[in-house]
Interface confidence: low
């Protein structure tokens, strides 16, 4: 005999108190699969958490963190203060950017310094963990008689730094 509850779709539950008919999930609850005997309470994003996706009758709410904090954990069940400039967040915590990479923000990843020589430029200002290098004029432009200084080339699209 087929379980009558198996016919109840997501967004409903099989109500034992009402002859196993499919009742819609009450407010602030959801069921993401069919055949459920109860609906789960929606996750509430409070305090340092903010709502990224509202709860619906078929899916739970999703949270992220308020400005100045970042998610920790696969389901963003924790919020932690952002890293400092010159760092990136890894599973091992906030880590300083490796030599040759930088991060000028409190979130995101460390990115490689611009390679000035790819554009035929020289390094005008060395890079740090917090700042990209500044490219200057090409060596040829610095020779006597050069008429103008070429403005620095825009930084290339950053790639991921190896960790």
């Amino acid at each position: 005999l087929q379980d009558p509850c198996s016919n109840c779709p997501a967004g409903t539950f099989c109500d034992n108190n009402r002859n196993q008919i499919c009742s819609p999930c009450p407010p602030n609850s959801f069921s993401s699969a069919g055949g459920q005997r109860t609906c789960d309470i929606c996750r509430q994003c409070k305090g340092v958490f903010r709502t990224r996706k509202e709860c619906s009758s078929t899916s739970n709410a999703e949270c992220d963190c308020t400005p100045g904090f970042h998610c920790l954990g696969a389901g963003c069940s924790m919020c932690e203060q952002d890293c400092k400039q010159g760092q990136e967040l890894t599973k091992k915590g906030c880590k300083d950017c490796c030599f040759g990479t930088f991060n000028d923000q409190k979130r995101g990843i460390c990115r490689p310094w611009t390679n000035c020589s790819l554009d035929g430029k020289s390094v005008l200002v060395n890079g740090t963990k917090e700042r990209d290098v500044v490219c200057g004029p090409s060596p040829a432009d610095l020779s006597p008689g050069a008429s103008s200084v070429t403005p620095p080339a825009p930084a290339r699209e950053p790639g991921h730094s190896p960790q």
């Epitope: 920790l72 954990g73 696969a74 389901g75 069940s77 924790m78 599973k91 091992k92 915590g93």
Partner: antibody
Framework: EVQLQQSGAEVKKPGATVKLSCKAS????????IHWVNQRPGQGLEWIGR????????AYAPKFQDRATLTVDTSTNTAYLELSSLRSEDTAVYYC??????????WGQGTTVTVSS | QIVLTQSPATLSASPGERVTLSCTAS???????LHWYQQKPGSSPKLWIY???NLASGVPARFSGSGPGTSYTLTISSMEPEDAATYYC?????????FGQGTKLEIK
């Protein structure tokens, strides 16, 4: 949606080996440690070990050092626990859980392993 | 390894009652690495409080956590029926990570 889907229940004889799987979806397994924790019937939680899928770094609890092997297949986003030389006291629910440098935050549904002759 | 001892083993509380669960560590644990999990029968544990006093996402505000060093507490300001569960403290300060034996909280 973030999920850790664990393999089905296993019944094994003493001395046998069991290999459990834990498939991650909704996130990249390389971004987190994967821990394994067991819970014997009516008992508390016990840490077995963890693996960093990014670089293969592994740590085991001393109790499981000689019998547990943690592996990961990053191409399928799946982590594995192999436990050898099974004995009756290994009868337990085995959980995989994601973690970072200080907590375990998201847990699979668990796999029941029964060791019986 | 760090041993975590929880007390009481079982506690029965009435709705609306204030509840305090205790976790004592055999040696000092940094507050950043002391967490609490909630587990209901037949379900996986859920991270409940992290780093001593921070509520995990979705945890009701009636829960709080406190404690430095070796003595930590989880408090429920006003017990609700859905709070009936087993609560485990957990340290990740020293390897191997360890759990307390759990406190089973029942509703009267």
């Amino acid at each position: 949606e973030v999920q850790l889907q664990q393999s089905g229940a296993e019944v094994k004889k003493p001395g046998a080996t069991v290999k459990l799987s834990c498939k991650a979806s909704g996130f990249n397994i390389k971004d987190y440690y994967i821990h394994w924790v067991n819970q014997r019937p009516g008992q508390g939680l016990e840490w077995i070990g963890r693996i960093d899928p990014e670089d293969g770094d592994i740590a085991y609890a001393p109790k499981f050092q000689d019998r547990a092997t943690l592996t990961v297949d990053t191409s399928t986003n799946t982590a594995y626990l192999e436990l050898s030389s099974l004995r009756s006291e290994d009868t337990a629910v085995y959980y995989c859980t994601t973690g970072n440098y200080y907590a375990m935050d998201f847990w699979g549904q668990g796999t029941t392993v029964t060791v019986s002759s | 390894q760090i041993v975590l001892t929880q007390s009481p083993a079982t506690l029965s509380a009435s709705p609306g009652e204030r509840v305090t669960l205790s976790c004592t560590a055999s040696s000092s644990v940094s507050s950043s690495y002391l967490h609490w999990y909630q587990q209901k029968p037949g379900s996986s544990p859920k991270l409940w409080i992290y780093s001593t006093s921070n509520l995990a996402s979705g945890v009701p505000a009636r829960f709080s956590g406190s404690g430095p060093g070796t003595s930590y507490t989880l408090t429920i300001s006003s017990m609700e029926p859905e709070d009936a569960a087993t609560y485990y403290c957990h340290q990740y300060h020293r390897s191997p990570p360890t759990f307390g034996q759990g406190t089973k909280l029942e509703i009267k």
